[in-house]
């Protein structure tokens, strides 16, 4: 997909930090999502995994931001080939993994 501008990526990183900082209670009532290969995938794959979560206000803004980075409409299960061995993880862990991955990309200058 198209490379998002660094400012938009920074905003996404900040939102992911907002919903995870000092958070120990399960996000989205402990909902589970597909673990994905973040290196092989990208924003659309991350959105695909989170599309399965509904009725969770904590990640609605994240879902909207990810959809802005994805050039086409994503439907649940569209990127199942990039799921990690049919492994599911909690939303909170998924969000933290995504956050660390995006920060790594940002530090490496891939979005500047």
């Amino acid at each position: 997909g198209p490379v998002p501008p660094s400012t938009a990526l920074r905003e996404l990183i900040e939102e992911l930090v907002n919903i995870t900082q000092n958070q120990k209670a399960p996000l989205c009532n402990g909902s589970m999502v597909w673990s994905i290969n973040l290196t092989a995938g990208g924003f659309c794959v991350a959105l695909d995994s989170l599309t399965n979560v509904s009725g969770c206000s904590a990640i609605e803004k994240t879902q909207r931001m990810l959809s802005g980075f994805c050039p086409h409409k994503v439907s649940a299960g569209q990127f199942s080939s990039l799921h990690v061995r049919d492994t599911k993880i909690e939303v909170a862990q998924f969000v933290k993994d995504l956050l660390l991955h995006l920060k790594k990309l940002f530090r490496e200058g891939q979005f500047n």
Epitope: R10, I13, E14, V17, N18, T20, Q21, N22, K24, F106
Partner: antibody, heavy 126, light 109 residues
């Protein structure tokens, strides 16, 4: 050696201003969320505020008693944290510590690591 | 504003178990951190994220959390553990930090 060294404390009249500095060394300061904590004479610790790392937004948050009067900033090129204190009151008299912010530890490279300065004394008196 | 409540003081004999509690409405969803402060010194982190112990902190220090209460436990308290202990956490937004009022631990020699 991992350390934080504060400076800039002193005696100031009510209504006056002061800027504290905190020089960091021995760790990747730019990745760290940083806090200011104060302790009035004979009293407990009081959280003053924090600043996130730039990559995490650089956002600042403040405790209610200092909001609008104190400003936290950072200069990652100098590995230095600042606390600008305006409209000082006698109740701001305290030892001021800078410290790595443990809430932000997960996001930086100092998970489980704890760094505090030795503190600098601010006295507000007429 | 959000508050964390600690007992002002706890006393134990050497070798006994000391428990210091910290209560706050956001603790079911927010981590607690514990600091030890000896007279005239800067605080030292002894427990982070409810129950994790930083390197260099003796194993006798442990932490737990249940509901609105976090607990610091010192198993087999020693004279050198005599200090003020502060719990630290954030409000429900995670944006604003807060310290408990502190607990003076006395280890009766």
């Amino acid at each position: 050696e991992v350390q934080l060294v504060e400076s800039g404390g002193g005696l100031v009249k009510p209504g006056g201003s002061l800027r504290l500095s905190c020089a960091a060394s021995g760790f990747t300061f730019s990745n760290a969320w940083m806090s200011w904590v104060r302790q009035a004479p004979g009293k407990g610790l009081e959280w003053v505020g924090r600043i996130r790392s730039e990559i995490d937004g650089g956002t600042t948050n403040y405790a209610a008693p200092v909001k609008g009067r104190f400003t936290i900033s950072r200069d990652d090129s100098k590995n230095t944290l600042y606390l600008q204190m305006n409209s000082l009151r006698t109740e701001d008299t305290a030892v001021y510590y800078c410290a790595t912010d443990q809430v932000g530890a997960y996001y930086g490279d100092y998970y489980g690591m704890d760094v505090w300065g030795q503190g600098t004394t601010v006295t507000v008196s007429s | 504003s959000y508050e964390l409540t600690q007992p002002p003081s706890v006393s134990v004999s050497p070798g006994q178990t000391a428990r210091i509690t910290c209560s706050g409405d956001a603790l079911p969803e927010k981590y607690a951190y514990w600091y030890q402060q000896k007279s005239g010194q800067a605080p030292v982190l002894v427990i982070y994220e409810d129950s994790k112990r930083p390197s260099g902190i003796p194993e006798r220090f442990s932490g737990s959390s249940s509901g609105t209460m976090a607990t610091l436990t010192i198993s087999g308290a020693q004279v050198e553990d005599e200090a003020d202990y502060y719990c630290h956490s954030t409000d429900s937004s995670g944006n604003h930090g807060v310290f408990g009022g502190g607990t003076k631990l006395t280890v009766l020699g």
